[in-house]
Interface confidence: medium
Protein backbone atom coordinates (compact mmCIF):
# COMPACT_ATOMS: atom_id res chain seq x y z
CA UNK A 1 0.00 0.00 0.00
CA UNK A 2 3.18 2.25 -0.15
CA UNK A 3 2.59 4.68 -2.84
CA UNK A 4 -1.69 5.29 -2.61
CA UNK A 5 -1.47 8.91 -1.58
CA UNK A 6 -0.01 11.81 -4.00
CA UNK A 7 2.55 13.27 -3.16
CA UNK A 8 3.22 16.47 -1.67
CA UNK A 9 3.75 18.96 -5.37
CA UNK A 10 6.17 20.87 -3.89
CA UNK A 11 9.02 21.37 -0.92
CA UNK A 12 11.14 24.39 -0.30
CA UNK A 13 13.06 26.35 2.42
CA UNK A 14 12.23 29.71 3.49
CA UNK A 15 15.09 30.71 5.44
CA UNK A 16 16.47 33.86 6.85
CA UNK A 17 19.37 34.27 9.46
CA UNK A 18 19.04 31.07 12.27
CA UNK A 19 15.19 30.75 10.58
CA UNK A 20 15.21 28.16 8.61
CA UNK A 21 11.54 27.11 7.44
CA UNK A 22 10.71 24.04 5.55
CA UNK A 23 7.54 24.70 3.18
CA UNK A 24 5.27 22.17 1.08
CA UNK A 25 2.10 22.24 -0.54
CA UNK A 26 -0.42 19.88 0.37
CA UNK A 27 -1.84 17.28 -1.49
CA UNK A 28 -5.36 17.53 -3.22
CA UNK A 29 -8.47 16.09 -1.60
CA UNK A 30 -6.26 15.47 1.78
CA UNK A 31 -8.53 14.24 4.75
CA UNK A 32 -8.53 15.33 8.22
CA UNK A 33 -6.08 12.12 9.20
CA UNK A 34 -3.32 13.66 6.70
CA UNK A 35 -0.03 14.45 8.04
CA UNK A 36 3.21 14.58 6.35
CA UNK A 37 6.52 13.09 7.63
CA UNK A 38 9.97 15.49 7.05
CA UNK A 39 12.89 14.16 6.68
CA UNK A 40 16.65 15.94 6.74
CA UNK A 41 19.79 14.64 4.60
CA UNK A 42 23.12 16.70 5.13
CA UNK A 43 25.26 16.81 2.40
CA UNK A 44 28.47 14.70 3.29
CA UNK A 45 26.27 12.41 5.35
CA UNK A 46 24.27 10.57 2.88
CA UNK A 47 21.92 8.95 5.07
CA UNK A 48 18.27 11.03 5.93
CA UNK A 49 17.09 11.79 9.33
CA UNK A 50 13.59 11.48 10.09
CA UNK A 51 12.62 14.77 11.80
CA UNK A 52 9.21 14.65 12.33
CA UNK A 53 6.74 11.58 11.56
CA UNK A 54 2.74 13.43 11.29
CA UNK A 55 3.09 17.06 11.25
CA UNK A 56 -0.18 18.42 10.04
CA UNK A 57 0.94 22.05 9.15
CA UNK A 58 1.96 22.79 6.04
CA UNK A 59 5.64 24.34 7.24
CA UNK A 60 8.20 23.06 9.92
CA UNK A 61 11.19 24.96 11.54
CA UNK A 62 14.31 23.21 10.76
CA UNK A 63 16.49 26.09 12.54
CA UNK A 64 17.45 23.70 15.64
CA UNK A 65 18.31 20.84 13.60
CA UNK A 66 20.26 23.17 10.81
CA UNK A 67 22.38 25.56 13.01
CA UNK A 68 25.39 24.29 11.36
CA UNK A 69 24.16 25.56 8.27
CA UNK A 70 26.31 28.51 7.80
CA UNK A 71 29.60 26.23 8.01
CA UNK A 72 28.45 23.29 5.85
CA UNK A 73 28.29 22.41 2.26
CA UNK A 74 24.08 22.35 3.14
CA UNK A 75 20.66 20.08 3.46
CA UNK A 76 17.93 18.93 0.99
CA UNK A 77 14.96 18.03 3.07
CA UNK A 78 11.95 15.63 2.11
CA UNK A 79 8.33 15.36 2.65
CA UNK A 80 5.92 12.84 2.09
CA UNK A 81 2.14 12.47 2.92
CA UNK A 82 0.60 9.87 5.58
CA UNK A 83 -2.59 8.50 6.40
CA UNK A 84 -3.39 5.93 8.56
CA UNK A 85 -0.78 3.10 7.01
CA UNK A 86 -0.76 4.80 3.72
CA UNK A 87 1.92 6.97 2.40
CA UNK A 88 2.78 8.78 -0.93
CA UNK A 89 6.23 8.94 -2.18
CA UNK A 90 8.99 11.15 -0.94
CA UNK A 91 9.08 14.74 -2.39
CA UNK A 92 12.38 16.24 -2.03
CA UNK A 93 13.74 19.59 -1.99
CA UNK A 94 14.80 20.80 -6.17
CA UNK A 95 18.11 22.53 -4.74
CA UNK A 96 20.59 22.18 -1.89
CA UNK A 97 19.62 24.35 0.98
CA UNK A 98 22.62 26.29 1.61
CA UNK A 99 23.92 29.68 3.31
CA UNK A 100 23.48 31.07 -0.52
CA UNK A 101 19.84 30.27 0.10
CA UNK A 102 19.18 32.40 3.11
CA UNK A 103 17.57 35.69 2.39
CA UNK A 104 19.73 38.62 4.47
CA UNK A 105 17.60 41.07 6.89
CA UNK A 106 18.60 43.63 9.29
CA UNK A 107 17.21 43.28 13.04
CA UNK A 108 16.07 47.34 13.02
CA UNK A 109 17.10 50.37 11.91
CA UNK A 110 17.45 53.18 14.79
CA UNK A 111 17.47 57.08 13.41
CA UNK A 112 18.24 60.45 15.35
CA UNK A 113 18.78 63.95 14.20
CA UNK A 114 21.87 65.84 14.31
CA UNK A 115 22.34 69.45 13.40
CA UNK A 116 20.55 68.60 9.95
CA UNK A 117 21.44 65.11 9.30
CA UNK A 118 19.25 62.20 9.73
CA UNK A 119 21.91 59.65 11.20
CA UNK A 120 21.20 55.91 10.78
CA UNK A 121 22.71 53.15 13.02
CA UNK A 122 21.60 49.99 10.98
CA UNK A 123 21.45 46.78 13.69
CA UNK A 124 22.49 43.07 12.46
CA UNK A 125 19.86 40.76 13.51
CA UNK A 126 20.65 38.31 16.58
CA UNK A 127 18.49 35.67 16.14
CA UNK A 128 18.07 33.36 19.95
CA UNK A 129 18.87 30.11 18.06
CA UNK A 130 22.32 31.45 16.94
CA UNK A 131 25.21 29.82 18.87
CA UNK A 132 26.72 32.24 20.57
CA UNK A 133 30.14 33.04 17.93
CA UNK A 134 27.60 33.10 14.82
CA UNK A 135 27.04 36.23 14.19
CA UNK A 136 25.65 38.18 11.60
CA UNK A 137 29.12 40.01 10.85
CA UNK A 138 30.78 36.99 12.14
CA UNK A 139 29.42 34.67 8.95
CA UNK A 140 29.19 37.82 6.94
CA UNK A 141 33.07 39.45 7.39
CA UNK A 142 33.16 40.82 4.52
CA UNK A 143 31.46 43.37 1.55
CA UNK A 144 28.29 44.19 3.83
CA UNK A 145 25.97 46.57 1.75
CA UNK A 146 22.98 48.19 2.59
CA UNK A 147 20.43 49.64 -0.22
CA UNK A 148 18.94 52.84 1.70
CA UNK A 149 15.16 54.72 0.96
CA UNK A 150 14.06 57.19 2.28
CA UNK A 151 10.66 58.76 1.91
CA UNK A 152 9.68 62.32 2.72
CA UNK A 153 6.37 63.20 3.98
CA UNK A 154 4.40 65.30 2.82
CA UNK A 155 6.44 65.71 -0.63
CA UNK A 156 6.42 64.95 -4.05
CA UNK A 157 9.68 62.99 -4.29
CA UNK A 158 9.66 59.65 -1.97
CA UNK A 159 12.40 57.84 -2.83
CA UNK A 160 16.61 58.35 -2.33
CA UNK A 161 18.32 55.03 -2.31
CA UNK A 162 21.91 54.67 -1.65
CA UNK A 163 24.40 51.53 -1.29
CA UNK A 164 26.49 51.82 2.11
CA UNK A 165 29.48 50.06 2.57
CA UNK A 166 29.05 50.22 7.05
CA UNK A 167 26.30 49.81 9.34
CA UNK A 168 25.85 53.71 9.81
CA UNK A 169 24.74 56.38 7.30
CA UNK A 170 23.83 60.17 7.45
CA UNK A 171 21.71 61.75 4.82
CA UNK A 172 22.37 65.66 4.60
CA UNK A 173 18.29 67.06 4.74
CA UNK A 174 19.22 70.48 3.18
CA UNK A 175 16.80 72.39 5.21
CA UNK A 176 14.12 70.13 4.16
CA UNK A 177 11.56 69.47 7.29
CA UNK A 178 8.89 67.14 7.46
CA UNK A 179 8.81 63.16 8.33
CA UNK A 180 11.62 61.13 6.93
CA UNK A 181 11.03 57.32 7.12
CA UNK A 182 13.60 55.04 6.12
CA UNK A 183 14.06 51.21 4.94
CA UNK A 184 17.32 49.39 4.57
CA UNK A 185 18.06 46.36 2.83
CA UNK A 186 21.54 44.02 3.07
CA UNK A 187 23.61 42.72 0.82
CA UNK A 188 27.15 40.97 0.44
CA UNK A 189 28.48 41.92 -2.12
CA UNK A 190 30.25 39.01 -2.61
CA UNK A 191 27.55 36.77 -2.61
CA UNK A 192 24.11 36.31 -4.20
CA UNK A 193 21.60 36.10 -1.28
CA UNK A 194 18.29 38.04 -1.85
CA UNK A 195 18.13 40.79 0.91
CA UNK A 196 14.40 41.59 2.42
CA UNK A 197 13.57 45.43 2.69
CA UNK A 198 13.38 46.19 6.44
CA UNK A 199 10.47 47.27 8.39
CA UNK A 200 9.68 51.15 8.08
CA UNK A 201 10.96 53.48 10.50
CA UNK A 202 9.91 57.55 10.87
CA UNK A 203 11.85 60.54 12.40
CA UNK A 204 10.49 64.03 12.61
CA UNK A 205 12.49 66.87 11.56
CA UNK A 206 11.31 70.70 12.72
CA UNK A 207 13.60 73.63 12.05
CA UNK A 208 14.42 73.31 16.07
CA UNK A 209 16.99 70.73 14.38
CA UNK A 210 19.03 73.23 12.36
CA UNK A 211 21.78 75.23 13.77
CA UNK A 212 21.66 78.88 12.67
CA UNK A 213 25.32 80.53 12.01
CA UNK A 214 25.36 83.87 10.88
CA UNK B 1 31.83 75.33 -18.20
CA UNK B 2 28.87 72.27 -18.90
CA UNK B 3 26.80 72.26 -21.91
CA UNK B 4 23.58 70.21 -21.59
CA UNK B 5 21.53 68.68 -24.84
CA UNK B 6 18.65 66.86 -24.41
CA UNK B 7 17.18 64.23 -27.72
CA UNK B 8 14.31 61.28 -27.67
CA UNK B 9 11.25 63.11 -26.99
CA UNK B 10 8.02 63.14 -29.02
CA UNK B 11 4.66 62.00 -29.19
CA UNK B 12 3.52 58.48 -27.89
CA UNK B 13 -0.03 56.91 -26.70
CA UNK B 14 -0.30 56.23 -23.16
CA UNK B 15 0.97 53.14 -21.88
CA UNK B 16 3.84 53.81 -24.53
CA UNK B 17 7.42 54.14 -23.55
CA UNK B 18 10.33 56.58 -24.75
CA UNK B 19 13.91 57.17 -23.91
CA UNK B 20 15.38 60.76 -23.66
CA UNK B 21 19.12 60.98 -23.61
CA UNK B 22 21.00 64.01 -22.57
CA UNK B 23 24.53 64.62 -23.93
CA UNK B 24 27.16 66.98 -21.96
CA UNK B 25 29.95 68.62 -23.96
CA UNK B 26 32.16 70.78 -22.36
CA UNK B 27 33.20 68.68 -19.55
CA UNK B 28 32.61 65.75 -17.93
CA UNK B 29 29.83 64.73 -15.27
CA UNK B 30 32.40 63.34 -13.18
CA UNK B 31 31.88 64.73 -9.58
CA UNK B 32 28.16 65.94 -10.61
CA UNK B 33 24.93 65.10 -9.72
CA UNK B 34 22.69 65.18 -12.71
CA UNK B 35 18.84 64.91 -13.20
CA UNK B 36 16.07 65.46 -14.95
CA UNK B 37 12.99 68.10 -14.41
CA UNK B 38 10.23 68.66 -16.22
CA UNK B 39 7.26 71.54 -16.79
CA UNK B 40 3.65 71.38 -18.11
CA UNK B 41 2.04 73.86 -19.98
CA UNK B 42 0.80 76.44 -16.66
CA UNK B 43 2.53 74.49 -14.17
CA UNK B 44 5.93 74.79 -11.89
CA UNK B 45 8.79 72.85 -12.69
CA UNK B 46 8.69 69.85 -11.08
CA UNK B 47 11.68 67.08 -9.88
CA UNK B 48 11.63 63.98 -11.70
CA UNK B 49 14.95 62.05 -11.17
CA UNK B 50 18.21 62.44 -10.44
CA UNK B 51 21.51 60.46 -10.40
CA UNK B 52 24.77 60.58 -8.62
CA UNK B 53 27.49 60.62 -11.68
CA UNK B 54 29.24 57.74 -9.55
CA UNK B 55 25.92 55.81 -9.56
CA UNK B 56 25.72 55.68 -5.61
CA UNK B 57 22.22 57.48 -4.83
CA UNK B 58 19.29 57.86 -7.09
CA UNK B 59 16.30 60.25 -6.25
CA UNK B 60 13.07 59.50 -7.48
CA UNK B 61 9.72 62.16 -7.81
CA UNK B 62 6.57 60.61 -6.51
CA UNK B 63 4.84 60.86 -9.61
CA UNK B 64 7.20 58.42 -11.62
CA UNK B 65 8.78 56.23 -9.01
CA UNK B 66 8.38 52.57 -10.64
CA UNK B 67 7.93 53.85 -13.56
CA UNK B 68 10.42 55.66 -14.84
CA UNK B 69 14.45 54.57 -14.31
CA UNK B 70 17.64 56.97 -14.75
CA UNK B 71 20.49 55.72 -15.62
CA UNK B 72 24.01 57.67 -17.53
CA UNK B 73 26.79 55.84 -19.32
CA UNK B 74 30.53 57.38 -18.33
CA UNK B 75 32.43 56.52 -21.45
CA UNK B 76 29.69 58.50 -24.09
CA UNK B 77 28.96 61.08 -20.87
CA UNK B 78 25.34 60.94 -21.35
CA UNK B 79 22.57 61.04 -19.13
CA UNK B 80 19.51 58.49 -19.83
CA UNK B 81 15.76 59.04 -18.78
CA UNK B 82 13.84 55.44 -19.78
CA UNK B 83 10.32 55.94 -19.08
CA UNK B 84 7.21 53.49 -18.99
CA UNK B 85 3.48 53.13 -18.71
CA UNK B 86 3.49 57.03 -19.67
CA UNK B 87 0.02 59.20 -18.85
CA UNK B 88 -1.35 61.81 -20.30
CA UNK B 89 -0.08 64.01 -17.06
CA UNK B 90 3.51 63.18 -17.64
CA UNK B 91 3.39 65.95 -21.01
CA UNK B 92 5.35 68.57 -20.01
CA UNK B 93 8.79 69.91 -21.13
CA UNK B 94 11.79 67.51 -20.13
CA UNK B 95 15.09 69.22 -18.80
CA UNK B 96 18.60 67.82 -18.16
CA UNK B 97 20.48 69.24 -15.61
CA UNK B 98 23.30 69.23 -13.93
CA UNK B 99 25.22 70.16 -10.12
CA UNK B 100 28.10 70.13 -8.67
CA UNK B 101 28.93 67.81 -6.23
CA UNK B 102 27.39 64.00 -5.43
CA UNK B 103 27.08 64.23 -1.54
CA UNK B 104 24.11 62.12 -0.54
CA UNK B 105 21.72 65.13 0.12
CA UNK B 106 18.51 66.48 -0.53
CA UNK B 107 19.11 69.59 -2.22
CA UNK B 108 19.62 67.91 -5.63
CA UNK B 109 15.58 67.55 -5.29
CA UNK B 110 15.62 71.36 -6.23
CA UNK B 111 15.92 73.21 -9.27
CA UNK B 112 17.81 76.09 -7.61
CA UNK B 113 20.78 73.28 -6.41
CA UNK B 114 21.25 72.88 -10.23
CA UNK B 115 23.93 75.12 -12.23
CA UNK B 116 24.02 73.94 -15.93
CA UNK B 117 20.69 73.45 -17.78
CA UNK B 118 19.45 72.02 -20.98
CA UNK B 119 17.24 73.81 -23.69
CA UNK B 120 14.38 70.99 -22.68
CA UNK B 121 12.65 68.62 -25.13
CA UNK B 122 9.09 67.86 -25.60
CA UNK B 123 7.03 65.10 -24.62
CA UNK B 124 3.40 64.27 -25.70
CA UNK B 125 1.40 61.53 -24.87
CA UNK B 126 -2.10 61.30 -26.03
CA UNK B 127 -4.96 58.90 -24.31
Known amino acids: HGTELPSPPSVWFEAEFFHHILHWTPIPNQSESTCYEVALLRYGIESWNSISNCSQTLSYDLTAVTLDLYHSNGYRARVRAVDGSRHSNWTVTNTRFSVDEVTLTVGSVNLEIHNGFILGKIQLPRPKMAPANDTYESIFSHFREYEIAIRKVPGNFTFTHKKVKHENFSLLTSGEVGEFCVQVKPSVASRSNKGMWSKEECISLTRQYFTVTN | QVQLQESGGGLVQAGDSLRLSCAASGRTFSGYTVGWFRQAPGKEREFVAA????????YFGDSVKGRFTISRDSAKNTLYLEMNKLKPEDTAVYYC????????????????????WGQGTQVTVSS
Open chain 2, 97 to 116: AAATGQEWSLQYLRESSYAY
Open chain 2, 51 to 58: ITWNGDTT
